[in-house]
């Protein structure tokens, strides 16, 4: 193993990470020295993990602390042995305090599951350390949770099947350890953007994995294929959901962050994207009537092409709390687009455009926009993202999504943008013009557009309004209306029917 230890700046703290390497510095020195040095004023040895049963939606309420072997607090605080029990597990912390997302999640769980037990696993003393040390403590914390669960199982009516561990960042791997160490199998683990550093590529027993619970679902919101990935990139659950490709989250760009605060930094962007997993989960709890659907796909690029909007053979699922158990799958990667804020739901459409002739295109890819007109609403002007290139005499597939429910689609306006948007495109246009001076008229022909709704699984074909006019050129538009054969529906199930 290489001796070079990369220095990693995460948020405003620089720390070294190298598994097992002693790191002599950190916030206010080595915290474990403080925690384990005998003090004259602190003689009692306290467990490093506390279990706080949140007995009220009031975030300021102190709740009840549970400890193994002490049954009285369970009675005093009305712990419901037959109800669902949620364990919320926080991650690494720089401040040593619970972050704001915590009470949002607690409150959402109480709102959705009124009789449930909501327990916050407080491992702040072990998490408020150098990242490497916090990572090394995850196993210990997992053991503590497993011990608590083993003790609860001794009680009448308590079932591990009713236990749902929800772990954020480093807490997701803590949940994995807990599920691994407990006697029996917990019902569910949800990993909210599980931590990447020191876990990416790790052995199955040293990170969250599908073996850790009856059902393991994961949301990945801060993965990076270049630079540091704060969240783990690899799939680690039965289903692994990558909203917006699992990397750049809408509303979290530097511009968005700068817009909302005077001194926006990369810190806020990182926090926003990493924490987005929590908010997507909260959204699934409180906006039950607006579920977001994810679609199985081999990779993000194929999803961006609109190829993967199928619900056949369990290829789509609700995200977050409403996800349907899929134990037969492992490491199934699923994708979706989202809005920038709650409710996050969008409506996905696959657009298949058959280009049957293609004149004088040169090197430059055209920029297309579509506007969808529906019975409920009309969309904004939506860009057609060209992932590779426009193919001639072939069907080109695109993904578009709208923030509102348009209802049944009635017509489509396709626009080819005239003016180039970048100097690079302008240069390519100029070169193209020089190389083809006698064929200035760029044009392509489209007869029909086939549209499939991801949410309803309905398919519809749109034909040009004027069958004689199928050509489109820069700065022009082409209108399409529902073809006479109307809605064409295959034997594909709608996610709204299939999912709970």
């Amino acid at each position: 193993m290489s001796n070079s230890v990369p220095l990693l700046c995460f948020w405003s703290l620089c720390y070294c990470f190298a598994a097992g390497s002693p790191v002599p510095f950190g916030p206010e020195g080595r915290l474990e020295d403080k925690l384990h040095k005998p003090k004259a004023t602190q003689t009692e040895v306290k467990p490093s993990v506390r279990f706080n049963l949140r007995t009220s939606k009031d975030p300021e309420h102190e709740g009840c602390y549970l400890s193994v072997g002490h049954s009285q607090p369970l009675e005093d605080c009305s712990f419901n042995m037959t109800a669902k029990t949620f364990f919320i597990i926080h991650g690494w912390t720089m401040s040593g305090i619970f972050e704001n997302w915590l009470h949002k999640l607690v409150s959402a769980l109480h709102t959705r599951e009124k009789d449930a037990n909501v327990v916050v696993v407080d491992w702040l003393p072990l998490a408020h350390q150098l990242y490497t040390d916090a990572v090394n403590n995850t196993r210990v914390v997992g053991h503590s949770i497993a011990r608590m669960l083993d003790w609860l199982q001794e009680k009448d009516d308590f079932s591990l099947g009713n236990v749902h561990l929800i772990g954020y960042s480093l807490g997701a791997h803590v949940a994995g350890y807990a599920g691994n160490f407990v006697k029996g199998t917990v019902g569910r683990i949800t990993g909210l953007d599980p931590a990447g550093p020191m876990f990416e590529g790790a052995d199955i027993h040293k990170r969250l994995s599908p073996d850790d619970a009856d059902f393991v679902d994961v949301l990945h919101t801060y993965t990076r294929s270049f630079g540091l990935s704060i969240g783990i990139q690899m799939p680690v659950g039965h289903i692994d959901i990558y909203p917006n490709g699992g990397d750049f989250q809408p509303g979290c760009g530097l511009n968005d962050v700068l817009g909302s605060i005077a001194y926006g930094t990369i810190t806020e962007v990182v926090k926003c994207e990493h924490e987005r997993a929590v908010h997507l989960f909260v959204d699934s709890l409180v906006n039950q009537d607006k579920p977001s659907f994810a679609f199985q796909c081999t990779d993000s690029n194929r999803f961006k092409k609109g190829i993967c909007l199928s619900c056949r053979k369990n290829r789509c699922n609700s995200i977050g709390y409403n996800a349907k158990k899929m134990r037969n799958k492992r490491n199934s990667k699923m994708y979706l687009k989202t809005r920038a804020g709650m409710p996050f739901r969008v409506y996905h459409y696959q657009m298949k455009i058959h280009v049957f002739s293609y004149k004088n295109m040169g090197e430059i890819e055209p920029t297309f926009y579509v506007t969808l007109y529906g019975t409920n609403a009309d969309s904004q002007t939506l860009p057609l993202e060209i992932v590779e290139r426009i193919e001639q005499n072939a069907t080109n597939t695109f993904l578009v999504y709208t923030e509102e429910d348009l209802g049944d689609l009635l017509k489509i306006q396709l626009t080819w943008e005239g003016a180039s948007q970048s100097w690079y495109n302008l240069w390519k246009e100029f070169r193209s013009y020089l190389s083809q001076p006698r064929n200035p008229g760029r044009e392509l022909n489209i007869r029909r557009i086939r549209v499939k709704s991801g949410e309803t699984q309905r398919k519809l074909t749109f034909c040009t309004e004027d069958p004689e006019n199928t050509s489109i050129s820069p700065g022009r538009e082409l209108w399409f209306r529902k073809c006479r054969d109307g809605w064409r529906m295959k034997n594909e199930t709608s996610p709204t029917v299939e999912l709970p």
Epitope: E60, E62, M94, I97, H103, L124, M342
Partner: antibody
Framework: QIQLVQSGPELKKPGETVKISCKAS????????MNWVKQAPGKGLKWMGW????????TYTDDFKGRFAFSLETSASTAFLQINNLKNEDTATYFC?????????????WGQGTTLTVSS | DIVLTQSPASLAVSLGQRATISCKAS??????????MHWYQQKPGQPPKLLIY???NLESGIPARFSGSGSGTDFTLNIHPVEEEDAATYYC??????????FGGGTKLEIK
């Protein structure tokens, strides 16, 4: 009822050490964090940092790193603020104030304050 | 660090009238629909006392003539109708996520 009772006024010379206490009653001491706040004469409030009353881990703001130390005597439900190598600019009233670990971290109960005068 | 700027530094209000104190933050103190801004009252020789938490929630035992509003970076404390016993210095404080948590410079209210 909930109370935070601080030790009495202190008169010290520069270079000396002072230890101010804050005794809590009426609630479970380890279930709430304890803050320390400085108020120089005729000035506003300045947050110094806080201590986790369960783990004993202190957190200091940049201006209060070095000569300042937060500590606990959990069995006596008491938090302490110690200032070493006192300087004239440490002359102020020091308050302890609790906050909930959960929720929005406002300071709901305060000690009556301890006036520290540093003068040669 | 988030800087809180209170205005005015001092104000004199007649008995029964409205007192309005403003607090501007250098960056947003909101988090997912909640504002992490709080208001305290401090009388001479006494510790501060919590009046309003999370921008607009009245602490128990505080008279209803005190109210708070605002979101993002702009917050207001209103006292109406002002009473004699309201003469004090008022401080805003933010506790949005990672410390340091900060206080505004204070506004001294005098009753005419």
């Amino acid at each position: 009822q909930i109370q935070l009772v601080q030790s009495g006024p202190e008169l010290k010379k520069p270079g000396e050490t002072v230890k101010i206490s804050c005794k809590a009653s009426g609630y479970t001491f380890t279930n709430y964090g304890m803050n320390w706040v400085k108020q120089a004469p005729g000035k506003g409030l300045k947050w110094m940092g806080w201590i986790n009353t369960y783990s004993g881990v202190p957190t200091y703001t940049d201006d209060f790193k070095g000569r300042f130390a937060f500590s606990l005597e959990t069995s006596a439900s008491t938090a302490f603020l110690q200032i070493n190598n006192l300087k004239n600019e440490d002359t102020a009233t020091y308050f302890c104030a609790r906050f909930s670990y959960y929720g929005r971290h406002y300071f709901d109960y305060w000690g009556q304050g301890t006036t520290l005068t540093v003068s040669s | 660090d988030i800087v809180l700027t209170q205005s005015p530094a001092s104000l004199a209000v007649s008995l029964g009238q409205r007192a309005t104190i403003s607090c501007k933050a250098s960056q947003s103190v909101d988090y997912d629909g909640d504002s992490y801004m709080h208001w305290y009252q401090q009388k001479p020789g006494q510790p501060p006392k919590l009046l309003i938490y999370a921008a607009s929630n009245l602490e128990s035992g505080i008279p209803a003539r005190f109210s708070g509003s605002g979101s993002g970076t702009d917050f207001t404390l209103n006292i109406h109708p002002v009473e004699e016993e309201d003469a004090a210095t008022y401080y805003c404080q933010q506790t949005n996520d990672d410390p340091p948590w900060t206080f505004g410079g204070g506004t001294k209210l005098e009753i005419k």
